[in-house]
């Protein structure tokens, strides 16, 4: 899987959304979860409604709410008002009894409020090394990872 | 501000069939779920079923079975329920509720009396 | 089915007074629970969802809690406009289901 790369800056609510092929994950609930650690566990944050035919409800864990076109084939998840500790690699996945095949990874990436003079130390981005200039960009504000590029921080 | 304006009241013989409509104003009607809950007089909330305009695709619960029918129009923002094989025990308000958001049964219409009397 | 009980079947309160409305379900319905209210002559009104977000418009004094098979509907000081009947719903699982009700009746 290709790493997808979903920017918003702090503060602000980021939308990411997961395409899927909906006849594939018919009936199949979806969930949002963050990826520990390069070989951890993916720990779910939020997952979509018990009820497969009432996917389309926004349910919500805390700031993130998550919601499935199930006809679409498009997982849409929100994160409200985007902190610097929401910046990492994310997962979405189908699931189907207590497997779970992941649509989509997704690296979100917390940007610095410009109107916020306070000091943005503590935002993560990858590196300037790690150029952007070829990225694939979906819409504004996300793009497919490099080829090289580290989906993690840089661990001290 | 989405609003769910229900048909008026009705009165039916026993063995008949009641068709009541709900018809949706604000919001997109065919993305979320229209459920029919019933209340007879003196008694508790009951639901019926939950239609899926988007889909068609309906659900109802195991009592009403083969006896009611959900169907939604999309071309004019209403859905519709219809009871058939009336009992004097189908005596009761039906309401019909729509999901906004968060949960099925975010807005209500005002409530449909049927009275099933011989 | 799931089926929801609720208790006390009645409350007897005055004005500025707490309540505590609870509901219990036969089955773990994690957090798919929802109160409504409910006046004479009126429709429901949702209250709270998924067990403990208050809808919009509804006043703080409103809060939900609880998870599992334990749930509980406090009005932290009650108006006169809260006397009326309220309902818990679930629907994490079909059919839905709701409790039978508590009436918050004037002392």
């Known amino acids: 899987h290709n790493t997808t790369v979903f920017q918003g800056v702090a503060g602000q609510s980021l939308q990411v959304s997961c395409p899927y092929d909906s006849m594939k994950h018919w009936g199949r609930r979806k969930a949002w979860c963050r990826q520990l650690g390069e070989k951890g566990p993916c720990q779910r944050v939020v997952s979509t409604h018990n009820l497969w035919l009432l996917s389309f409800l926004r349910r919500w864990n805390g700031s993130t709410a998550i919601t499935d076109d199930t006809l679409g084939g498009t997982l849409t998840i929100t994160l409200r008002n985007l902190q610097p500790h929401d910046a990492g690699l994310y997962q979405c996945q189908s699931l189907h009894g207590s497997e779970a095949d992941t649509l989509r990874k997704v690296l979100v990436e917390v940007l610095a409020d410009p109107l916020d003079h306070r000091d943005a130390g503590d935002l993560w981005f990858p590196g300037e090394s790690e150029s952007f200039e070829d990225a694939h960009v979906e819409h504004s504000i996300s793009r497919s990872l490099l080829e090289g590029e580290i989906p993690f921080p840089p661990t001290s | 501000q989405v609003q769910l304006v229900q048909s008026g009241a009705e009165v039916k013989k026993p063995g008949s069939s009641v068709k009541v409509s709900c018809k949706a104003s604000g919001g997109t009607f065919a993305q979320y779920a229209i459920s029919w809950v019933r209340q007879a007089p003196g008694q508790g909330l009951e639901w019926m079923g939950v239609?899926?305009?988007?889909?068609?695709?309906?659900n109802y619960a195991q009592k009403f079975q083969g006896r009611v029918t959900i169907t939604a129009d999309e071309s004019t923002s209403t859905a519709y329920m219809e009871l058939s094989s009336l009992r004097s025990e189908d005596t009761a308000v039906y309401y019909c509720?729509?999901?906004?958001?968060?949960?099925?049964?975010?807005?209500w219409g005002q409530g449909t009396m049927v009275t099933v009397s011989s | 089915e799931i089926v929801l009980t609720q208790s006390p079947a009645t409350l007897s309160l005055s004005p500025g007074e707490r309540a505590t409305l609870s509901c219990r379900a036969s089955q773990s319905v994690s957090s798919y629970l929802a109160w409504f209210q409910q006046k004479p002559g009126q429709a429901p009104r949702l209250l709270i969802y998924?067990?403990?977000n208050r809808a919009t418009g509804i006043p703080a004094r409103f809060s939900g809690s609880g998870s599992g098979t334990d749930f509980t509907l406090t009005i932290s000081s009650l108006e006169p406009e809260d006397f009326a009947v309220y309902y818990c719903q679930q629907d994490y699982e079909w059919p839905i289901t709701f409790g039978g009700g508590t009436k918050v009746e004037i002392k």
């Open positions: 239609i899926i305009p988007d889909s068609g695709t309906a």
């Open positions: 998924d067990a403990s």
């Open positions: 509720a729509r999901t906004q958001e968060n949960t099925i049964f975010d807005i």
